[in-house]
C-alpha cells in the first residue's frame, strides 16, 4: 500500500501497526496487561471497535472503508501503567486522483462487471488496479480482464465469482510516475448488486375456462430459494387501444411457480411476460420473451 502511516505516541511506544491487506491492527504485547482496547475513528467521527484477538495484542476490522482516511487508536493498561497510541491512516496522494463513480453488478448468475471513472485531477499516465477480498479474507482476487479507455483501466470483467462471499471489499489502487494516486475502496453486498435474468421455461396452457402460466425461477449467483423470489406477470391483450392498462400481477415465489386465471373461449390473442426480483429488494429483472396465446378471431 502506498498510504503512509503516521504514529502519534508518547515516549514509550506500543509500536502500533496496521496491515491493510488483512485489516489487522497490532501492537507490542505488554507484560501483565489488565485491559486492552482498539478502535478507529473515521472522518465523520464514527467509531468502530472490533473484538480483540485471542492474544489481546491485535484486532481485526471486518467491514470498514479507508479511503476517506481514518485514525486508529490503542489503549493498554498494565499493572504498572497505561499506554495510549494513535495511528493516522491517511489516503495519501493528490486529492481527486482516486477512481470515482465506482459500481459493480453481477449478471447471468456468474459474471460481474465493475466500472469506474478516472479521478478529475489524475495525470494522463494514471493506471488503476482492482483487488477484491471476500469477507472471510481468505483470498484476494486481482482483476483478470480490464476494460480500458485510451489505455487507462476504467473497468473490470470477472467470469469466475467463486472467490466472492455475500459481502466483499473492493479496492482500486492507482499508480503514476508523476504523482501519488489516492485509492478508493468500497464494501458491496452481492445481493444488492445482482441483476437477475428473467424467469425461464415460461409456458401457457389453456382449457375452455382458464389459462395456466408456469415458469422456472432464474438461476442466480446468490443462494436463493423459492420463497426469496417475487414475480410480476404482464398479461396483455393484443391489438388494444394505445394507453389501455396492462394487467400486472404480483405472485410470490413457490416450489412450483404457476398462475391460473379465468379466460374463457373464444379468447382474443394475448401475450404474457414475466420478470423476477429478490422479494426483499425488488430489483426487477428484465422481462422474459412474450409468449402469445389465444387467436386473432377470438
Amino acid at each position: 500500500e502506498k498510504s503512509d502511516l503516521r504514529t502519534v505516541a508518547p515516549a514509550s511506544s506500543l509500536n502500533v501497526r496496521f496491515d491493510s491487506r488483512t485489516m489487522n491492527l497490532s501492537w507490542d504485547c505488554q507484560e501483565n496487561t489488565t485491559f486492552s482496547k482498539c478502535f478507529l475513528t473515521d472522518k465523520k467521527n464514527r467509531v468502530v471497535e472490533p473484538r480483540l484477538s485471542n492474544n489481546e495484542c491485535s484486532c481485526t476490522f471486518r467491514e470498514i472503508c479507508l479511503h476517506e482516511g481514518v485514525t486508529f487508536e490503542v489503549h493498554v493498561n498494565t499493572s504498572q501503567r497505561g499506554f495510549q497510541q494513535k495511528l493516522l491512516y491517511p489516503n495519501s496522494g493528490r486529492e481527486g486522483t482516486a477512481a470515482q463513480n465506482f459500481s459493480c453488478f453481477i449478471y447471468n448468475a456468474d459474471l460481474m462487471n465493475c466500472t469506474w471513472a478516472r479521478g478529475p485531477t489524475a495525470p494522463r499516465d494514471v493506471q488503476y488496479f482492482l483487488y477484491i477480498r471476500n469477507s472471510k479474507r481468505r483470498r484476494e482476487i486481482r482483476c483478470p480482464y480490464y476494460i480500458q479507455d485510451s489505455g487507462t483501466h476504467v473497468g473490470c470483467h470477472l467470469d469466475n465469482l467463486s472467490g466472492l462471499t455475500s459481502r466483499n471489499y473492493f479496492l482500486v489502487n492507482g499508480t503514476s510516475r508523476e504523482i501519488g494516486i489516492q485509492f478508493f475502496d468500497s464494501l458491496l453486498d452481492t445481493k444488492k448488486i445482482e441483476r437477475f435474468n428473467p424467469p425461464s421455461n415460461v409456458t401457457v396452457r389453456c382449457n375452455t375456462t382458464h389459462c395456466l402460466v408456469r415458469w422456472k425461477q432464474p438461476r442466480t449467483y446468490q443462494k436463493l430459494s423459492y420463497l426469496d423470489f417475487q414475480y410480476q406477470l404482464d398479461v396483455h391483450r393484443k391489438n388494444t387501444q394505445p394507453g389501455t392498462e396492462n394487467l400486472l400481477i404480483n405472485v410470490s415465489g413457490d416450489l412450483e411457480n404457476r398462475y391460473n386465471f379465468p379466460s374463457s373461449e373464444p379468447r382474443a390473442k394475448h401475450s404474457v411476460k414475466i420478470r423476477a426480483a429478490d422479494v426483499r429488494i425488488l430489483n426487477w429483472s428484465s422481462w422474459s420473451e412474450a409468449i402469445e396465446f389465444g387467436s386473432d378471431d377470438g
Epitope: S225, Y226, L227, L255, R280
Partner: antibody, heavy 120, light 111 residues
Framework: QVQLVQSGAEVKKPGASVKVSCKIS????????IHWVRQTPTKGFEWMGG????????VYAQRFQGRVTMTEDTSIDTAYLTLSSLRSDDTAVYYC?????????????WGKGTMVTISS | QAVLTQPSSVSGAPGQRVTISCTGS?????????VSWYQQLPGTAPKLLIY???KRPSGVPDRFSASKSGTSASLAITGLQADDEADYYC???????????FGGGTKVTVL
C-alpha cells in the same frame, strides 16, 4: 405438489445407529436444500444440519458433530440422516424439511416425521 | 433451554386477537436475521405461517400477521377460530451457532 415422504418409525438400542430416509416427490432434490430438525417434548426443536449452498456442502450443528451424517442420492431424490452412538435422549421425532428461504432459514414443506425410540 | 424465548401459553375467545412474543439476541433476531413462524397441530409436522419476518406463503390466511423489532418478534392472530388451537413456534438463524434456532413454543387455546 411437492412432498417429502419419510421412512417409518424405528426402535434402537443405546450405542446403535439409525438411518432415516426422506424421499422428495414432485421436484428434483438437486435443486433443493434439505435440512434435518428433531423434536423432543423436553428440548423442543433442535436443528441438526443440512445443505449450505454458500459453503456448497452439508453443515452440521456443533452438538451433533461426529455423530451425525447427512447424505443425498440425487438419482432417486432421497436424503438420508444417520445418527450413531445413540443415547436415550436421542428419542425424538426426526423431520426433514426443504429450505424455502435462506434468509433466516424458513422451512416449507416438512416431512411427516420419523419417530425414533432409544430403549434397552 | 430454547434459544428464542416464547410464552408457554396464550388464550382468547373466538373472534378475538392474540399475540405471541419471541425474544432473541444480537446473534439471531437482532443480527439481523429473518424470523419465521410455524403452526403445529397435535400429531402433525410444523407448517410455515410467516417467513421474512412478515410475509405469508400462499394458502395462509391474512388473519395471521407478524412483525419484528430489534431482538424480538411477534405473531398476531386476529379473528381467532377453533382450528387455530395449536402450538406456535418462532425460528431464526443464529450466527454464533451457525444454524437454525427455535423458540420453545406457545400453546394457543381458544376458549
Amino acid at each position: 405438489q411437492v412432498q417429502l415422504v419419510q421412512s417409518g418409525a424405528e426402535v434402537k438400542k443405546p450405542g446403535a445407529s439409525v438411518k432415516v430416509s426422506c424421499k422428495i416427490s414432485g421436484h428434483s432434490l438437486s435443486e433443493l436444500s434439505i435440512h434435518w430438525v428433531r423434536q423432543t417434548p423436553t428440548k423442543g426443536f433442535e436443528w441438526m444440519g443440512g445443505f449450505d449452498p454458500e459453503e456448497n456442502e452439508i453443515v452440521y450443528a456443533q452438538r451433533f458433530q461426529g455423530r451425525v451424517t447427512m447424505t443425498e442420492d440425487t438419482s432417486i431424490d432421497t436424503a438420508y440422516l444417520t445418527l450413531s452412538s445413540l443415547r436415550s435422549d436421542d428419542t425424538a421425532v426426526y423431520y426433514c424439511a426443504i429450505v424455502g428461504s435462506f434468509s433466516g432459514l424458513a422451512y416449507r414443506p416438512w416431512g411427516k416425521g420419523t419417530m425414533v425410540t432409544i430403549s434397552s | 433451554q430454547a434459544v428464542l424465548t416464547q410464552p408457554s401459553s396464550v388464550s382468547g375467545a373466538p373472534g378475538q386477537r392474540v399475540t405471541i412474543s419471541c425474544t432473541g439476541s444480537g446473534s439471531n433476531i437482532g443480527a439481523p436475521y429473518d424470523v419465521s413462524w410455524y403452526q403445529q397441530l397435535p400429531g402433525t409436522a410444523p407448517k410455515l405461517l410467516i417467513y421474512h419476518n412478515n410475509k405469508r406463503p400462499s394458502g395462509v390466511p391474512d388473519r395471521f400477521s407478524a412483525s419484528k423489532s430489534g431482538t424480538s418478534a411477534s405473531l398476531a392472530i386476529t379473528g381467532l377460530q377453533a382450528d387455530d388451537e395449536a402450538d406456535y413456534y418462532c425460528q431464526s438463524y443464529d450466527s454464533s451457532l451457525s444454524g437454525s434456532v427455535f423458540g420453545g413454543g406457545t400453546k394457543v387455546t381458544v376458549l
